[in-house]
């Protein structure tokens, strides 16, 4: 008799997770030097034990807690770049400027990027079937407490001046209920920020409007600045040509505005 | 509870050597749990992280103070210290010590627990 399994709204966890967040450790302790002395096996067991046998909607921090000790990683402080609902050119910008970091460019954000993965209340199996949706079922998932979680961590690491990519493109530029605008903004360090920094990227390419003065960013600027933090914000109108003279800044068109 | 005390004295010699002392209550020093270091506060300015020491022994120190920093542990003490030498009155500052808990990201600067502080001026 087949039992009975929850339907939940969002994607099942992605096929061959164990596979792919083992695979992924292996890869990253490779590459970096100062996280070879991490144990992958021991990271996917503690991965795997903050929602196996646990209901999806009633995941917690502390569940995420051994993985987080075991994914322990030092971030320059002053080189962290925050971003939202721009990953991919984010990405692309660190990968180029290897001295800043996204999340992703930690041990603990390159192994869950782009995954899903939950659990079923009592079994030891992986729901590859359905996990909850953040609205439509419950946002104490497994996935949205991992990010949360990461994410509070990471703001909390920064000092200096801090920087941020938004997409130009969308409606809300700065969105209150992003990641960036619901955990990243509010676990950034007075004492230790001296400033935020928004680089708004630009879609249309004969978009010459100022998006800084867009409202949803004095939206973040007043956020921010009622929380001790100074806050500029930059245009990038040409987001080939910014990332172009990241890679090459003696070219003689990176001079002008980007 | 973690709980940190600042010891030393409150006034040093120009281009004298400063030199302070972090008690650690509540948890080891050795524990792999934490990291410690110090940061400063001069009148009127913002804080600034001067270094850190993690568990295994390894440092970070704040570059522009680099060639005058030491951060040490003392295990059997549960305490780590700080040694500045060369001092100017620039060096006048409130001088805290800090811990932070190791897990999941962390930056240079430790922020979770801090000591109450202790004025250090140098004056002759």
């Known amino acids: 008799v087949p039992r009975w399994r929850q339907q939940w709204s969002g994607p099942g966890t992605t096929k061959r997770f164990p596979e792919t967040v083992l695979a992924r450790c292996v890869k990253y302790t490779e590459i970096h030097p100062e996280m070879r002395h991490v144990d992958c096996q021991s990271v996917w067991d503690a991965f795997k034990g903050a929602f196996i046998s646990k209901h999806p909607c009633n995941i917690t921090e502390e569940d995420y807690q051994p993985l987080m000790k075991l994914g322990t990683q030092t971030v320059p402080c002053n080189k962290i770049l925050l971003w939202s609902r721009i990953k991919d050119l984010a990405h692309q910008f660190t990968q180029v400027q290897r001295d800043m970091f996204t999340l992703e460019d930690t041990l603990l954000g390159y192994l869950a990027d782009d995954l899903t993965w939950c659990g079923e209340f009592n079994t030891s199996k992986i729901n590859y079937q359905s996990c909850p949706d953040w609205r439509k079922d419950c946002s104490n998932n497994p996935v949205s407490v991992f990010w949360k979680t990461v994410s509070r961590r990471f703001a909390e690491a920064a000092c200096d001046v801090v920087h941020v990519m938004l997409n130009g493109s969308r409606s809300k530029i700065f969105d209150k209920n992003s990641t960036f605008g619901s955990v990243e903004v509010h676990n950034l360090q007075p004492e230790k920020v001296q400033t935020l920094e928004a680089w708004v990227i630009h879609g249309g390419r004969e978009d010459s409007r100022d998006l800084c003065q867009d409202p949803t960013i004095k939206e973040l600027e007043s956020i921010i600045s009622k929380r001790n933090i100074q806050f500029s914000c930059k245009n990038i109108y040409r987001p080939d040509k910014f990332l172009q003279c990241v890679k090459n800044p003696e070219d003689s068109s990176c001079t002008s505005e980007i | 509870q973690l709980q940190l005390q600042e010891s030393g004295p409150g006034l040093v010699k120009p281009s004298e050597t400063l030199a302070l002392t972090c008690n650690v209550s509540?948890?080891?020093?050795?524990?792999?749990?934490?990291?410690w270091g110090w940061i400063r506060q001069p009148p009127g300015k913002r804080l600034e992280w001067i270094g850190s020491i993690y568990h295994t022994g390894s440092t970070h120190y704040n570059p522009s103070l680099k060639s005058r920093v030491t951060i040490s542990v003392d295990t059997s003490k549960n305490q780590f210290s700080l040694t500045l030498s060369s001092v100017t009155a620039a060096d006048t500052a409130v001088y805290y010590c800090?811990?932070?808990?190791?897990?999941?990201?962390?930056?240079?600067?430790?922020?979770?627990?801090r000591g109450q502080g202790t004025l250090v001026t140098v004056s002759s």
């Open positions: 509540g948890g080891s020093i050795s524990s792999s749990s934490y990291y």
């Open positions: 800090a811990g932070g808990d190791r897990y999941g990201p962390v930056g240079q600067w430790p922020s979770d627990y």
